[in-house]
């Protein structure tokens, strides 16, 4: 005997009740796959997170996060606290990075400048909470001995007449 | 279904107490930590409190420190918010949060929050 249920396409589940008829998912039900024997439940997006996509009856709801928190997860299973840049989330809230780190985002932690030496180059720009250290040429090139040819012309770029 | 239901709430005196409950169902209340946070009039979620599976580790921001105790009772299913010297700032609404259990991606996520008691501190 063929199974009838693998003509129920998505959006439909296939009642046993009556004779394996396809019956379309019940409101805040869905299957995203043919062939199903129940619906599943939709996905309900409240308290911490916001709808980004509505269910359908062939697709779950998408959440997001409320603002000053964002997604953790596959399929955004949690919302985690925001943090201002320069901060990062601890046990007891959001912050301030210590010196010598930074973070430049609203999540994730705080990390160590950029130590410049270990290239053999000087620090051109100084780290701040929010910024890492911005990394310049060698102290050797900086010497007053070193060479001062003047740089060649920028190349221009094909295309472009000349201002 | 995870439930999760504030009760407590209510209109108080500047530096009054007030004790917020929260009864949790359709999950296993001990394998998670769980967390306290309120929105204020025209502001938004702010993180308050949070406590681990068993009651040993305890944070708060630092403005209820000292002031707000965060506890939990296992065998009933219930998180509670003993809320002392309550200032004017401490008015909003006060949601009780999952949090993470010890697999979760963080300990400061949450993925599930209750309808919220409402706070009131008046002179």
């Known amino acids: 005997l063929q199974d009838l249920c693998s003509n129920c396409p998505a959006g439909t589940f296939c009642d046993n009740n009556r004779s394996q008829i396809c019956s379309p998912c019940p409101p805040n039900s869905f299957s995203s796959a043919g062939g199903q024997r129940t619906c599943d439940i939709c996905r309900q997006c409240k308290g911490v997170f916001k709808t980004r996509k509505e269910c359908s009856s062939t697709s779950n709801a998408e959440c997001d996060c409320i603002s000053g928190y964002h997604c953790l997860g596959a399929e955004c299973s949690m919302c985690e606290q925001d943090c201002k840049q320069g901060q990062e989330l601890t046990k007891k809230g959001c912050k301030d990075c210590c010196f010598g780190t930074f973070n430049d985002q609203k999540r994730g932690i705080c990390r160590p400048w950029t130590n410049c030496s270990l290239d053999g180059k000087s620090v051109l720009v100084n780290g701040t909470k929010e910024r890492d250290v911005v990394c310049g040429p060698s102290p050797a090139d900086l010497s007053p001995g070193a060479s001062s040819a003047t740089p060649p012309a920028p190349a221009r770029e094909p295309g472009h007449s000349p201002q | 279904e995870v439930q999760l239901v504030e009760s407590g709430g209510g209109l108080v005196q500047i530096g009054g107490s007030l004790r917020l409950s929260c009864a949790a169902s359709?999950?296993?209340?001990?394998k998670y930590w769980m967390i306290w946070v309120r929105q204020a009039p025209e502001k938004g979620l702010e993180w308050?409190?949070?406590?681990?599976?068993?009651?040993?580790?305890?944070y708060y921001v630092d403005s209820v420190e000292g002031r707000f105790t965060i506890s939990r009772d296992n065998a009933n299913n219930s998180l509670f918010l003993q809320m002392n010297s309550l200032r004017a700032e401490d008015t909003a609404v006060y949601y009780c949060?999952?949090?993470?259990?010890?697999?979760?991606?963080?300990?400061?996520?949450?993925?599930?929050s209750g309808q919220g008691t409402r706070v009131t501190v008046s002179s």
């Open positions: 359709g999950f296993t209340f001990s």
């Open positions: 308050v409190a949070n406590i681990n599976q068993d009651g040993s580790e305890k």
């Open positions: 949060a999952r949090g993470g259990d010890d697999y979760s991606i963080s300990h400061f996520g949450m993925d599930v």
